[in-house]
């Protein structure tokens, strides 16, 4: 492993459709991929009227958007389905939402970011 990189070997697995899909609802997923590729964890969830509904969690494949992210954070503003990815074993156990504010004209009343959601 390269120094400073948190290598992902396993992730929290969760499937909201577990009863219908007849899988385990939750567990630990071992992550595989090409030897020269990086591996990550991910989480997807929905915000239904302020209530967080996890969709799926598990291993994610080599993705530059996940590089060197130790925390699983969604930064898009109000996506249809929230998604975050990270590096490091089980790093998707907790996830949060910090939308990046678009900087336009500075105002006298700065906008406070929305609070994060944590699993």
């Amino acid at each position: 492993a390269i120094l400073g990189r948190s290598e992902t070997q396993e992730c929290l697995f969760f499937n909201a459709n577990w009863e219908k899909d007849r899988t385990n609802q939750t567990g630990v997923e071992p992550c595989y991929g090409d030897k020269d590729k990086r591996r990550h964890c991910f989480a997807t969830w929905k915000n239904i009227s302020g209530s967080i509904e996890i969709v799926k969690q598990g291993c994610w494949l080599d993705d530059i958007n996940c590089y060197d992210r130790t925390d699983c954070v969604e930064k898009k503003d109000s996506p249809e389905v929230y998604f975050c990815c990270c590096e490091g074993n089980m790093c998707n156990e907790k996830f949060s939402y910090f939308p990046e504010m678009e900087v336009t004209q500075p105002t006298s009343n700065p906008v406070t970011p929305k609070p994060p959601y944590y699993n």
Epitope: N24, C31, L61, E80, F83
Partner: antibody, heavy 120, light 107 residues
Framework: QVQLVQSGAEVKKPGSSVKVSCKAS????????ISWVRQAPGQGLEWMGG????????NYAQKFQGRVTITADESTSTAYMELSSLRSEDTAVYYC?????????????WGQGTMVTVSS | EIVMTQSPSSLSASVGDTVTITCRAS??????LAWYQQKPGKAPRLLIY???HLQSGVPSRFSGSGSGTHFTLTISSLQPEDFATYFC?????????FGPGTKLEIK
């Protein structure tokens, strides 16, 4: 890199059963997510069901429920798909396929396919 | 069951063209959508997963987009080896269902 090698072609009578095997080589077989997909001649693709050997429980498409049994033998790194009460419309190529992840991102490694012909 | 439809069912194009294939789902599989290429007598090959992620080893002229219920596969600068049948597949919930396919032929 995982490789999937399937058993050879089969010719079966209507009403009988067929059992197709799929031997995996590569990383830990029990951690793979394996699906079975079939394709009738000149037709599209149809997902039949899947299994993660470490969990043991198979998941079947409603269409095949009661007629298909998917199992996995960890000792030989082999997955099996058995289809019973065969009819002519079951004539198809049957593929064993590995998924990228347990959350079913995509079917990335396919066996060579097994042609099953159902004919009286 | 999520029903997948594709359009067109077939199209003709020339080497160097850009083509777009559309896939629609009866219910939103979110982004759990994959695209496959299949040539006669061969097993399908995964091209795109999670609607827009290029599978390892697939040329960058293939791209995917969309979310919700509407997805597209675009092939830019068509090469002779790209003439094949293309399928979309949802893997949000079982049974995982495929589109009926789009046959891409040489004009």
């Amino acid at each position: 890199q995982v490789q999937l090698v399937q058993s050879g072609a089969e010719v079966k009578k209507p009403g009988s059963s067929v059992k197709v095997s799929c031997k995996a080589s590569g990383p830990r077989f029990q951690d793979l997510s394996i699906s079975w997909v079939r394709q009738a001649p000149g037709q599209g693709l149809e997902w039949m069901g899947g299994i993660i050997p470490i969990y043991g429980t198979a998941n079947y498409a409603q269409k095949f429920q009661g007629r298909v049994t998917i199992t996995a033998d960890e000792s030989t790194s082999t997955a099996y798909m058995e289809l019973s009460s065969l009819r002519s419309e079951d004539t198809a190529v049957y593929y064993c396929v590995k998924d990228l992840t347990w959350t079913n991102l995509g079917l990335d490694i396919w066996g060579q396919g097994t042609m099953v012909t159902v004919s009286s | 069951e999520i029903v997948m439809t594709q359009s067109p069912s077939s199209l003709s194009a020339s080497v160097g063209d850009t083509v777009t294939i559309t896939c629609r789902a009866s219910q939103g599989p979110s982004r759990w959508l994959a695209w496959y290429q299949q040539k006669p007598g061969k097993a399908p090959r995964l091209l795109i997963y999670w609607a827009a992620h290029l599978q390892s080893g697939v040329p960058s002229r293939f791209s995917g987009s969309g979310s919700g219920t509407h997805f597209t596969l675009t092939i830019s600068s068509l090469q002779p080896e790209d003439f094949a049948t293309y399928f979309c597949q949802q893997s949000y919930s079982t049974p995982f269902t495929f589109g009926p396919g789009t046959k891409l032929e040489i004009k």
